[in-house]
């Protein structure tokens, strides 16, 4: 139970980070114009990964497009690009899990094809989430050097007779939002991740250690193994999986190919 | 027709109080941001205040600050300037004007005078 | 605040004739966002309030003659009239609607001969 509600949730929670970093990646407010300290202007600018608007105190709002490709700052380019991959993998690995989902039966897909789409989908939700976190800081990153280059020549003017007010920006939501998205994405993912040990079937043999008593013997064997009466064929110590007996916290309790995660 | 009729103007006591109101019709009154506007006897604009679309945003000139207050009533398609601590320096004729593209000020009033005077 | 300067203050025509009138604002009304200058003129008639001519510095309002021209960037704005009618006779002012207070011009008027 523990697994499924582990990868369940991870699901979900991956499921909402990449809804936010889609969210963010499209949103217009990645900076905005900084009021602070600045006079008060009867217009508010705002830039966005794709467009940059303009809303007047009218209400009217005017946005523009970039119809440049090259003419783009490289950094501006970077952070599209970290933000669609995000986006991308983020979008196979919920395609991924979904299948994964102990919940889900399809066919007779084995746990261990689960377990293994368990992982890949963690995996991409994890480097998705840090797509976004890492495209998002960037961006800000850009913000904040930006900000103290134009506070340093915040008025500039033909011999201090005419001014010309810089446009600073400042934080936009969108970076809270691809923040927080991004950072459940990879909640998300890691979640994922814990989950595939749970569902990882059993591959190590333990060696049985047989008591024999006179007349009746019980080979004793530990979880992964059925106990058996006599001197049958089970006394040759194979595994037996048992996939609906055990509890999810034994599963997790044995070593399996999945641990180096 | 886009209309904006202005009522509540008169001769005041200086330190006195005033309200004006401003009865638009012929477009969505709700949907636009308004303006006051005076102008004084030397026939000199001065833009006196601005209220949002939902009233909880307003912008002031400094002179009349503390003593002005601009408000609306979206549902009765009005929209009011209340004026306390009334100056001989107020005295001007009262235009409200609906703000358009460019915070323009594409319609105006027939203005209202208000008088400060002892 | 922001202060307008209007030049000359008044300006003595005849019809037919072309005129340009001047605004000087004391800081840029240039927005760096959309590279709008946000400066209107207005004409307004003895006895009547005013009317919108021009938005963003050079965009005619609808039903304006298209000899009323607005033009500039920056700080330096001009009107130009470019064939003046007797029905043009009247004060012509520009207001900043960039930064707040909105302030106004003290006008040109334009009288004819």
């Known amino acids: 139970m523990a697994v499924t509600a582990c990868q369940g949730l991870g699901f979900v929670v991956s499921l909402i980070g990449i809804a936010g970093i889609i969210a963010a990646t499209c949103m217009d407010q990645w900076s905005t114009q900084d009021l602070y300290n600045n006079p008060v202007t009867a217009v508010f600018n705002y830039q966005g990964l794709w467009r940059s608007c303009v809303r007047e105190s009218s209400g009217f709002t005017e946005c523009r497009g970039y119809f440049t490709l090259l003419g783009l700052p490289a950094m501006l380019q970077a952070v599209r690009a970290l933000m669609i991959v995000g986006i991308v993998l983020g979008a196979i690995g919920l395609l991924v899990s979904i299948f994964a989902l102990k919940c889900i039966r399809i066919g007779s897909m084995e746990d261990s094809a689960k377990a293994n789409m368990t992982l890949t989908s963690g995996i991409m939700f994890i480097v998705s989430g840090l797509c976004a976190i890492a495209g998002v800081s960037v961006f800000a990153n850009m913000l904040v050097t930006n900000f103290w280059m134009s506070t340093a020549n915040m008025y500039t003017g033909m011999g201090g007779m005419v001014q010309t007010v810089q446009t600073r920006y400042t934080f936009g939501a969108a970076l809270f939002v691809g923040w927080v998205a991004g950072g459940l994405t990879l909640i998300g993912g890691v979640m994922m991740c814990i989950a595939c040990r749970g569902l990882a079937p059993e591959e190590t043999n333990y060696k049985a250690v047989s008591y024999h008593a006179s007349g009746h013997s019980v080979a004793y064997k530990p979880g992964g193994f059925k106990a058996s009466t006599g001197f049958g064929s089970n006394t040759k110590n194979k595994k037996i999986y048992d996939g609906g007996a055990r509890t999810e916290d034994e599963v997790q309790s044995y070593p399996s190919k999945h641990d180096y995660v | 027709e886009i209309q904006l009729v202005e009522s509540g103007g008169g001769l005041v006591r200086p330190g006195g109080s005033l309200k004006l109101s401003c009865a638009a019709s012929g477009f969505s009154f709700k949907n636009y941001v308004m303006s006051w506007v005076r102008q004084s006897p030397e026939r000199r604009l001065e833009w006196v205040a601005e209220i949002r679309t939902g009233g909880d945003y307003t912008y002031y000139v400094d002179t009349v600050t503390g003593r002005f207050t601009i408000s609306r009533d979206n549902a009765k398609n009005t929209l009011y300037l209340e004026m306390t601590s009334l100056r001989s320096e107020d005295t001007a004729t009262y235009y409200c004007?609906?703000?358009?593209?460019?915070?323009?000020?594409?319609?105006w009033g027939q203005g209202t005078t208000l008088t400060v005077s002892s | 605040d922001i202060v307008m300067t209007q030049s000359p203050s008044s300006l003595t025509v005849t019809a037919g004739e072309k005129v340009t009138m001047s605004c000087k604002s004391s800081q840029s009304l240039l927005n760096s966002g959309n590279q709008k200058n946000y400066l209107t003129w207005y004409q307004q008639k003895p006895g009547q309030p005013p009317k919108l001519l021009i938005y963003w510095a050079s965009t005619r309002e609808s039903g304006v003659p298209d000899r009323f021209t607005g033009s500039g960037s920056g700080t330096d704005f001009t009107l130009t009239i470019s064939s003046v009618q007797a029905e043009d006779l009247a004060v012509y002012s520009c207001?900043?609607?960039?930064?707040?207070?909105?302030?106004f011009g003290a006008g040109t008027e334009l009288e004819l001969k």
């Open positions: 207001q900043n609607n960039y930064f707040y207070p909105l302030t």
């Open positions: 004007a609906r703000v358009g593209y460019g915070n323009s000020l594409d319609y």
